[in-house]
């Protein structure tokens, strides 16, 4: 099932950043009824997923670049 269907938070610990070259796509989940925090989940090129800190300047830049490339939603 896609991450969008999750009915609880997925991220407890987060990374402050990650190499852009390792990222396939990024999903930004806004706070909602089932999770009060913004969650940024990167899908890596190896298929693994990682939680990124939405407040981190590096992560904000990653999201901007991925949006430009159409790899973020």
């Amino acid at each position: 099932a896609p991450l969008a269907t999750e009915l609880r938070c997925q991220c407890l610990q987060t990374l402050q950043g990650i190499h852009l070259k390792n990222i396939q796509s990024v999903k930004v989940k806004s706070p909602g009824p089932h999770c009060a925090q913004t969650e940024v989940i990167a899908t890596l090129k190896n298929g693994q997923k990682a939680c990124l800190n939405p407040a981190s300047p590096m992560v904000k830049k990653i999201i901007e670049k991925m949006l430009k490339n159409g790899k973020s939603n």
């Epitope: 991450l3 999750e6 009915l7 609880r8 938070c9 997925q10 991220c11 407890l12 610990q13 987060t14 990374l15 706070p31 089932h34 999770c35 009060a36 925090q37 989940i41 693994q48 997923k49 990682a50 939680c51 990124l52």
Partner: antibody, heavy 126, light 107 residues
Framework: QVQLVQSGAEVKKPGASVKVSCKAS????????IHWVRQAPGQGLEWMGN????????NYNEKFKSRVTMTRDTSTSTVYMELSSLRSEDTAVYYC???????????????????WGQGTLVTVSS | EIVLTQSPATLSLSPGERATLSCRAS??????LHWYQQKPGQAPRLLIY???RSVSGIPARFSGSGSGTDFTLTISSLEPEDFAVYYC?????????FGGGTKVEIK
């Protein structure tokens, strides 16, 4: 040792507020969600909500949303649960419990709450 | 909100007997179902997590099975200290929900 130690019993009047603390020790505070669960006398377990020790973001049961506030102090590894506008039905034992450990990999396989505080009896009576 | 229904409400058995406790969810919760034991005046204690995974320090006589909506806790041979109330709990989604409990009492 690994433990969650809660503050002592409280007696409150209807309409007042109560703030219960839960101090974590012996483990990595940021690797576990902290939940609050209450149990009225002779009744079952009722989930009130939880808090992320990392972001400080709290998720509340809709039933308590207007009356409950959960906060954390990372410097002392302590979590707080404040319940306002108390009524007699809020008389219960309040437990904190941890769920984890989780790292920065999202997972759909969740842990149960493997460590509980000793409980704090809150009595609401006029 | 998911509803967890436990049955039976009370189970009267003798030491040495096998106990089978049921927990049914109102909708699928994958395997994110956990079992807790509670004795009078004590906090709950986690016995089994993620349907069937064992918890350190919990005797091997406790085991769990199931998936989706139907789950079972089995105590293979009841010891005197096993007489208590047992709760199932789900955290597949929030709000987290607990069943109403099954009391295992001495026959």
């Amino acid at each position: 040792q690994v433990q969650l130690v809660q503050s002592g019993a409280e007696v409150k009047k209807p309409g007042a507020s109560v703030k219960v603390s839960c101090k974590a020790s012996g483990y990595e505070f940021t690797s576990y969600w902290i939940h609050w669960v209450r149990q009225a006398p002779g009744q079952g377990l009722e989930w009130m909500g939880n808090i992320s020790p990392n972001s400080g973001s709290a998720n509340y049961n809709e039933k308590f949303k207007s009356r409950v506030t959960m906060t954390r102090d990372t410097s002392t590894s302590t979590v707080y649960m404040e319940l306002s506008s108390l009524r007699s039905e809020d008389t219960a034992v309040y437990y904190c419990a941890r769920e984890g450990p989780y790292s920065y990999y999202p997972s759909r396989q969740y842990y149960g709450s493997d460590l509980w505080g000793q409980g704090t009896l809150v009595t609401v009576s006029s | 909100e998911i509803v967890l229904t436990q049955s039976p409400a009370t189970l009267s058995l003798s030491p040495g007997e096998r106990a089978t406790l049921s927990c049914r969810a109102s909708q699928s919760i994958s395997n994110n179902l956990h079992w807790y034991q509670q004795k009078p005046g004590q906090a709950p204690r986690l016995l089994i997590y993620y349907t069937s995974r064992s918890v350190s320090g919990i005797p091997a006589r406790f085991s769990g099975s199931g998936s989706g909506t139907d789950f079972t806790l089995t105590i293979s041979s009841l010891e005197p200290e096993d007489f208590a109330v047992y709760y199932c709990g789900q955290n597949n989604e929030w709000p987290e929900v607990f069943g109403g409990g099954t009391k295992v009492e001495i026959k």
